[in-house]
C-alpha cells in the first residue's frame, strides 16, 4: 500500500493576510485566523512529518480584497510559489480580468501547472494560450506518479469574463477522455481537482470512470467528521463518499473557503491505484498556529502599496451621493442607485444574441450603505470613501428567484417601514410602488422588472412564477436583515466580486458620475 | 474593537449629566450606536440608538424627553445628555454597537447613581 | 413588544442539556438575539437573527424559533457557562426580557 496526503485550498479569494473568524478584516491579532503566512507554517510541518504531499488549489484565488485590486494576481503567483503549491485549477473568478489578466499575471508567472479539461482556446487566442495552462498534468510523488486532471465551471461566461475565445464544455464530456489518456499513460492514481460545485464534484466522482479522489471549491462547501472546531456546519462528512457508477467508494472533499481551513486528506492506495482507505479532516488555521516569520515580513512589503492606493482618486463626482440613513432606509437614494448601477455593470455578459444581458436586476439592503460621499471635496472619489459607505466586506452575487420570492422580499423590505430599519430595498431595473396604508404582507402594489430577453430593455410586471437572475450581496443571499424567503428559496447561488471592487471599477470606468433619484422607488398617493 | 465609556457619578435628583463613549479599533462612523443600562441587581434596558451618520434617533419611552443621544464622528465619540435625572436612572450604563447583529461590541460599563 | 423568558432562574450541573425560552407578545419574524452575562461585565452576544452563533461563541450554544416562541439551548454545560442569559428583540425598538439566571446545582 501507498498513502497520499493531499492538503487542499479553495475559494481563498484574495485572503492573503489572516483575518477576522468570519473571513473579514482583522480587528483583533490573538483571534485571527488564516492567511498565507500561517497556511505555509502548517504546509512545511506536515511536509517535514509526512512522505508524499501534495498541496493543490481548486480555484478561485482571485477576487475579494484590496490585494487583488491592486496586484491584480501577481500576489497569488508570487505567495503559491512561495508555499510550493503543486498544482492549482482554474476558477471562474480567475477571468474577472479577461483572459489578459489571468496569462499575465499568473499563467505566465505561475510555476505550477494551471489546469483546466473542459475549457478549450479557439482562433486566435489558441496559440497564444497554448501551453500556459493544461487539461491535465502528472506529478511524481515520492517513487509514484499522480495525474490530476483540472475542471472549471461551465458558467464561467455568466460569472466572469473570459471572451469569445474561450469555449466552457460540460465537466463530465470533457474530464472522462483525459483520465483515459492518463491511464493509456499507465497513471492509475488520479485526482479530479477543478470549481465546479459540490453537486458536480459528486456527480464526477460517480460519473467519470478513473478519477480516484475529487478535490472541488465554488460553493465553499465545509465537510468535517466530529465535532467541527469553528462556526462553519458541515454539509457531509469529510471525505464525503460518493459511489461511482462502476462501484467504486470515491471520497469528495472541499476545504470551505477563505484560507480559513486547509484540507488534510490521507489516501491509501494499492499495487493497482485503487483507493484502499481514505480519512482526515480540515485543519482549521486559527492562532495556535504561528504565522511563519518570513512569509509575514514579505506580505508586509506588499502590503505598502495597499496604503498607498487607498487615498488615490479613482473618478469623480458631481452630485451629493446621499448615503444617509435618512434616505437609504426609507426611500429610493442616489448612493443605492449607483451601487446597484455598478453591480449591473459588473455582470454585463453579451452569451446570447436573444438576450441584450444575462440579468438586469439588483436588489441592495439601505442597511448595507453607511456612509454618504460629499461632492464638495473637489468631486474626489477614494477606495477609503468607499470603504465607509461598504464597511462590511461582502460580495454582489449572483442568485436565481422564482416572481414570487421576489414579491416576498419587497414585502419583507417594507414590513416594519419608518423605523430605520436596514432591510428596504434599493434597486436597479426595478420599479416598485408601496401603498403604506396596507397591512404588513401586501404593501407592494405595483412590481415592474426590466426586461433581458429584448433588444430593448423596458420594464414589464413581474410574474410570479418566472425564473429571474437578480444581483444582490451576498449578506442577503445568505438571509440577512430578515430575507430568510430569499436563504430558503433561492434557485442558484453564485459568489461574486469584492462590493467596494464592483464600485471602485465601475467609477474608474466611468470617471465622472451623477446618479440621480429617478422613480425606481414610489410610495401610492396618501400613504407617504 | 474597544468602547470606553465616561462621565458617570453621583448626581442629585433632577440633575444633569453627560455620559461619553470613546471608540477605536473599528470605522466607528459607519456604525449605529446605542446606549444600554442596567439597574443594580436588574435586567438590561434599551435606552436609546443613533444612526451612523446621525440623521435617525429613537429613546426608550422611559427616558423620551430627559436624554439626548448625539455623536461626533469626526473624535470617534458617542454621547448621552441625561437632564431631569430620577432616582430610577440609576444604573449602569453601556455603550454598544449594532446591537442583536453581527457587530456587537460593548463597552465596560459607566455607573450613574441619581440620590439626594 | 415585550418579551418573557422562562424559567428566571435554574440549576443544572456540568454536562446537562439546558433549555432556555423567551416569548415575544407579539410576532417578531427572526428578529431574536441571546446574551450571556457574567456579574460585572458587559453582556456578550451569543446567538442573532434567531439561530446564527456569534463569530467566537462555542458551538454548543444554539438558538431556534421563529414568530412568537424562541429557545436557547446549551447541549452540554461547561463550568463558564453558569450566569445570567437575556434574550432580546430587534424587530421594533429593541426590548430585552427579564434574564434567567443559570446557576450550579
Known amino acids: 500500500a501507498w498513502e497520499l496526503t493531499i492538503l487542499h485550498t479553495n475559494d481563498v479569494h484574495s485572503r492573503l493576510e489572516q483575518t477576522s473568524e468570519d473571513s473579514s478584516k482583522c480587528v483583533n491579532a490573538s483571534r485571527c485566523m488564516g492567511g498565507v503566512a500561517r497556511l505555509f507554517t502548517k504546509v512545511q510541518q506536515i511536509r517535514r512529518a509526512e512522505p508524499n504531499v501534495l498541496l493543490l488549489d481548486a480555484g478561485d484565488q482571485y477576487q475579494g480584497t484590496i490585494w487583488f485590486t491592486v496586484y491584480k494576481g501577481a500576489e497569488v503567483a508570487h505567495f503559491m510559489n512561495a508555499l510550493r503549491y503543486d498544482a492549482m485549477a482554474l476558477g471562474n473568478h480567475e477571468f474577472d480580468n479577461g483572459v489578459e489578466g489571468l496569462i499575465e499575471p499568473l499563467l505566465k508567472e505561475a510555476k505550477f501547472p494551471i489546469l483546466s479539461a473542459n475549457i478549450k482556446a479557439k482562433g486566435p487566442l489558441a496559440s497564444q494560450i497554448s501551453g500556459l495552462y493544461l487539461p491535465y498534468k502528472v506529478l511524481p510523488v515520492g517513487d509514484e506518479v499522480v495525474g490530476i486532471v483540472g475542471y472549471t465551471s461551465k458558467e464561467t461566461p455568466f460569472l466572469s469574463n473570459p471572451g469569445t475565445n474561450l469555449v466552457f464544455e460540460d465537466e463530465i464530456t470533457a474530464l472522462q477522455p483525459e483520465v483515459d489518456k492518463l491511464k493509456t499513460l499507465n497513471v492509475n492514481k488520479i485526482i479530479a481537482l477543478g470549481h465546479s460545485g459540490f453537486e458536480m464534484d459528486k456527480l464526477i466522482a460517480q460519473k467519470v470512470r478513473g478519477v480516484d479522489v475529487v478535490v472541488g471549491g465554488h460553493s465553499n462547501t465545509f465537510l468535517y467528521t466530529g465535532n467541527p472546531p469553528s462556526k462553519e456546519v458541515p454539509a457531509g462528512k469529510y471525505p464525503f463518499i460518493v459511489t461511482s457508477d462502476d462501484g467504486r467508494k470515491v471520497p469528495v472533499v472541499q476545504a470551505y473557503a477563505f484560507g480559513k481551513y486547509l484540507g488534510y486528506l490521507k489516501i491509501e492506495f494499492d499495487e493497482r491505484g485503487n483507493v484502499i482507505s481514505s480519512h482526515g479532516n480540515p485543519i482549521l488555521l486559527n492562532s495556535s498556529i504561528p504565522e511563519d516569520p518570513s512569509i509575514k515580513a514579505d506580505i508586509n512589503k506588499w502590503r505598502i502599496k495597499l496604503d498607498n492606493y487607498s487615498t488615490q482618486e479613482l473618478g469623480k463626482t458631481i452630485v451629493y451621493l446621499d448615503g444617509s440613513s435618512q434616505s437609504c432606509r426609507f426611500r429610493e437614494c442616489n448612493m443605492g442607485n449607483l451601487i446597484c448601477d455598478a453591480m449591473i455593470n459588473n455582470n454585463l455578459r453579451h452569451t446570447d444574441e436573444m438576450f441584450w444581458n444575462h440579468v438586469s436586476m439588483c436588489i441592495l439592503n439601505g442597511g448595507g450603505i453607511r456612509s454618504p460621499i460629499d461632492e464638495r471635496n473637489n468631486g474626489t472619489i477614494t477606495w477609503e470613501n468607499l470603504a465607509a459607505v461598504l464597511p462590511f466586506g461582502g460580495t454582489f452575487d449572483l442568485v436565481q428567484l422564482k416572481g414570487s420570492t421576489l414579491k416576498k422580499a419587497f414585502e419583507h423590505s417594507v414590513h416594519r417601514y419608518g423605523q430605520s430599519t436596514g432591510e428596504f430595498l434599493q434597486v436597479g431595473g426595478i420599479h416598485v410602488v408601496y401603498d403604506l396604508s396596507r397591512k404588513p404582507g401586501d404593501r407592494v402594489v405595483k412590481l415592474d422588472v426590466l426586461c433581458t430577453k429584448c433588444r430593448v430593455p423596458s420594464y414589464d410586471p413581474l410574474k410570479m412564477d418566472e425564473v429571474y437572475k437578480v444581483i444582490l450581496p451576498n449578506f442577503l443571499a445568505n438571509g440577512g436583515d430578515g430575507f430568510q424567503m430569499i436563504k430558503d428559496e433561492l434557485l442558484r447561488h453564485d459568489s461574486g466580486d469584492q462590493d467596494i471592487n464592483v464600485v471602485s471599477t465601475y467609477i474608474s470606468k466611468m470617471k465622472v458620475i451623477y446618479p440621480a433619484v429617478e422613480g425606481r422607488i414610489k410610495f401610492s398617493t396618501g400613504s407617504h | 474593537v474597544q468602547l470606553v465609556e465616561s462621565g458617570g457619578g453621583l448626581v442629585q435628583p433632577g440633575g444633569s449629566l453627560r455620559l461619553s463613549c470613546a471608540a477605536s479599533?473599528?470605522?466607528?462612523?459607519?456604525?449605529?450606536m446605542h446606549w444600554v443600562r442596567q439597574a443594580p441587581g436588574k435586567g438590561l434596558e434599551w435606552v436609546a440608538v443613533?444612526?451612523?451618520?446621525?440623521?435617525?434617533?429613537y429613546y426608550a419611552d422611559s427616558v423620551k424627553g430627559r436624554f439626548t443621544i448625539s455623536r461626533d464622528n469626526s473624535k470617534n465619540t458617542l454621547y448621552l445628555q441625561m437632564n431631569s435625572l430620577r432616582a430610577e436612572d440609576t444604573a449602569v450604563y453601556y455603550c454598544?454597537?449594532?446591537?442583536?447583529?453581527?457587530?456587537?461590541?460593548w463597552g465596560q460599563g459607566t455607573l450613574v447613581t441619581v440620590s439626594s | 413588544i415585550q418579551m418573557t423568558q422562562s424559567p428566571s432562574s435554574l440549576s443544572a450541573s456540568v454536562g446537562d442539556r439546558v433549555t432556555i425560552t423567551c416569548r415575544a407578545s407579539?410576532?417578531?419574524?427572526?428578529?431574536l438575539a441571546w446574551y450571556q452575562q457574567k456579574p460585572g461585565k458587559a453582556p456578550k452576544l451569543l446567538i442573532y437573527?434567531?439561530?446564527t452563533l456569534q463569530s467566537g461563541v462555542p458551538s454548543r450554544f444554539s438558538g431556534s424559533g421563529s414568530g412568537t416562541d424562541f429557545t436557547l439551548t446549551i447541549s452540554s454545560l461547561q463550568p463558564e457557562d453558569f450566569a445570567t442569559y437575556y434574550c432580546?428583540?430587534?424587530?421594533?425598538?429593541?426590548?430585552f426580557g427579564q434574564g434567567t439566571r443559570l446557576e450550579i446545582k
Open positions: 454598544a454597537t449594532e446591537i442583536a447583529a453581527k457587530g456587537d461590541y
Open positions: 479599533g473599528f470605522t466607528f462612523s459607519s456604525y449605529d
Open positions: 443613533m444612526s451612523y451618520e446621525g440623521s435617525n434617533k
Open positions: 407579539q410576532g417578531i419574524s427572526n428578529y
Open positions: 437573527a434567531a439561530s
Open positions: 432580546q428583540q430587534s424587530y421594533s425598538t429593541p426590548h
